[in-house]
Interface confidence: low
């Protein structure tokens, strides 16, 4: 008498999440009499997946009619596959008895579930940094299977190389997560720059997912300050201007001081944007020279984006005021944060 064989022809089957999986199983003989059952996993902790005779298995259906005479095909179809369904499935023949006795198992079919990664989420630094500093961006994507995945970083279309990427967990799992950190050196021209995290996976059929972050949320471009005196007016008033240029973000407060005393404070708002995304602002102060006996020290004090104030001072020469037409005397630099004066 030929020994009964339980044949599971596929060693592995890969299915997309949400689809149906067909697990094939045939037996070589109708003898001995007894049922076929499907299990996930082996050993005492195995999970019953399908038993024709009893139980309720709403997602599992037999491929062929198991009640027909001489049926030797015990393949099943599992619908609405999720990553949690991954594992090795065994088709097992039992000999009829009280109770039934396990006779022979198939070699097993490993079901792997192809699950799409979630849309990559890119997050930037919590605080802004200035040009020449390095900032880190993080990209996360979750819920994918199989584990093989490719992640690339781009800045303005150019691939970044200072990248560290981890896929978790390291061992077998129903689904995986990827987390990658890219280090980017900022330049003053990066207000309009963008970083892109691109994730490629077998489930995406060549159409990678992308997450983006704007460097405008990560960068601070400190202003240039220049204080100049315009021409003296006939009424003995001097117009002194403070030009604040090439700064980002727009959050900026400017204070004029006359001989150390606050004269006027202004907040920048609704400024036109430069081509590179930065802003310029010009403020002016009229000084009545005839009201002063001594030279007047004017200070333009700028607080940008919560940073320490930067000063630039300028002395208006009262003694020479009748002749100082169109003077453009160089401003004296008394910045409390010298790095921000260019």
């Amino acid at each position: 008498e030929e020994e009964l064989q339980v044949i599971q022809p596929e060693k592995s089957v890969s299915v997309a999440a949400g689809d149906s999986a067909t697990l094939n199983c045939t037996v070589s003989s109708l003898i001995p009499v007894g049922p076929i059952q499907w299990f996930r996993g082996a050993g005492p902790g195995r999970e019953l997946i399908y038993n024709l005779k009893e139980g309720h298995f709403p997602r599992v259906t037999p491929v062929s009619d198991p009640t027909k005479r001489n049926n030797m095909d015990f393949s099943i179809r599992i619908s609405n596959i999720t990553p949690a369904d991954a594992g090795t499935y065994y088709c097992v023949k039992f000999r009829k008895g009280s109770p039934d006795v396990e006779l022979k198992s198939g070699a097993g079919t490993e079901l792997s579930v192809r699950a799409k990664p979630s849309a990559p989420v890119v997050s930037g630094p919590a605080v802004r940094a200035t040009a020449e500093h390095t900032v880190s961006f993080t990209c996360e994507s979750h819920g994918f299977s199989p584990r093989d995945i490719t992640l690339k970083w781009f800045k303005n279309g150019n691939e970044l190389s200072d990248v560290q990427t981890n896929v978790d967990p390291a061992g077998k799992s129903v689904s995986y997560s990827i987390r990658s950190t890219a280090r980017v050196v900022l330049t003053r021209r990066d207000v309009h720059s963008q970083v892109i995290c691109e994730v490629a996976h077998v489930t995406l059929q060549g159409d990678p997912l992308r997450g983006t972050a704007n460097l405008s949320e990560a960068i601070r471009v400190p202003p240039f300050l220049e204080v100049t005196q315009q021409s003296m007016r006939a009424d003995n008033q001097v117009n002194v201007t403070c030009q604040v240029t090439k700064f980002y973000p727009q959050r900026l407060q400017l204070t004029w001081l006359e001989n150390g005393n606050v004269s006027r404070t202004e907040m920048a708002s609704a400024l036109p944007e430069n081509k590179d995304g930065t802003y310029n602002w010009t403020s002016w102060l009229l000084v009545n020279v005839s009201a002063h006996r001594d030279d007047v020290k004017l200070t333009c004090q700028v607080e940008h984006d919560g940073q320490p104030a930067v000063n630039k001072s300028f002395s208006v020469k009262v003694s020479a005021h009748p002749k100082e037409q169109g003077s453009n005397t160089a401003a004296e630099n008394t910045g409390t944060n010298e790095r921000n004066i260019y």
């Epitope: 949400g18 609405n80 979630s118 979750h142 689904s175 997560s177």
Partner: antibody, heavy 121, light 107 residues
């Protein structure tokens, strides 16, 4: 038993601030992304904000961006929502919810019972 | 942002009958869609995720289908406890967005 309990709701004037808390128990808090969802009186559900398990990534609805901040303290198993510059239209029941296992990928399968925020002068 | 539109706003069905609720997305959300049930005065409960996968403990009479922009929640034989509000939510693109809801009431 898996539980989430919100607190910190109340009556606040327009322009004011509130901080909501959500204390979680019965599961490994740091392994799950969390979310805040609100429901104005007689209206439908509105997703407000989400934060990853590690706290490294956050997301906001356009209606609250720049005013609300989501955060978490995994050592205390607590989720927070700092609400500033509150408006009358922020009046709602605020629910905290946990995503089901795979971070943001599936639905929110554990919910608190909600805390009421009323913004009125 | 992706706009989710549910129809009808109110659905009147007799107990034991089938109820079919629809949800449409303004652009494709793949299968990244969840359905929630909310009873009056209670927090929402997750019914379906991945467009068609039942959440833990959800009875087999609840089923979801669809992909892309068109989705359906079907309750095969309505029980008294099923009369409630139902919401769909997409989680394909930030910000995640809910539909405006369908109220299922006893006919």
């Amino acid at each position: 038993e898996v539980q989430m309990l919100e607190s910190g709701g109340g009556l606040v004037q327009p322009g004011g601030s509130l901080r909501l808390s959500c204390a979680a128990s019965g599961f490994t808090f740091s392994s799950y992304a969390m979310s805040w969802v609100r429901q104005a009186p007689g209206k439908g559900l509105e997703w407000v904000s989400a934060i990853s398990g590690s706290g490294s990534s956050t997301h906001y609805a356009d209606s609250v961006k720049g005013r609300f901040t989501i955060s978490r303290d995994n050592s205390k198993n607590t989720l927070y929502l700092q609400m500033n510059s509150l408006r009358a239209e922020d009046t709602a029941v605020y629910y905290c919810a946990a995503y089901s296992g795979s971070y943001y990928y599936y639905g929110m399968d554990v919910w608190g019972q909600g805390t009421t925020v009323t913004v009125s002068s | 942002e992706i706009v989710m539109t549910q129809s009808p706003a109110t659905l009147s069905v007799s107990p034991g009958e089938r109820a079919t609720l629809s949800c449409r997305a303004s652009q494709s959300v793949s299968r990244n869609l969840a359905w929630y049930q909310q009873k009056s005065g209670q927090a929402p409960r997750l019914l379906i995720y991945g467009a068609s996968t039942r959440a833990t403990g959800i009875p087999a009479r609840f089923s979801g289908s669809g992909s892309g922009t068109e989705f359906t929640l079907t309750i095969s034989s309505l029980q008294s406890e099923d009369f409630a509000g139902y919401y769909c939510q997409q989680y394909n693109n930030w910000p995640y967005t809910f539909g405006q809801g369908t109220k299922l009431e006893i006919k």
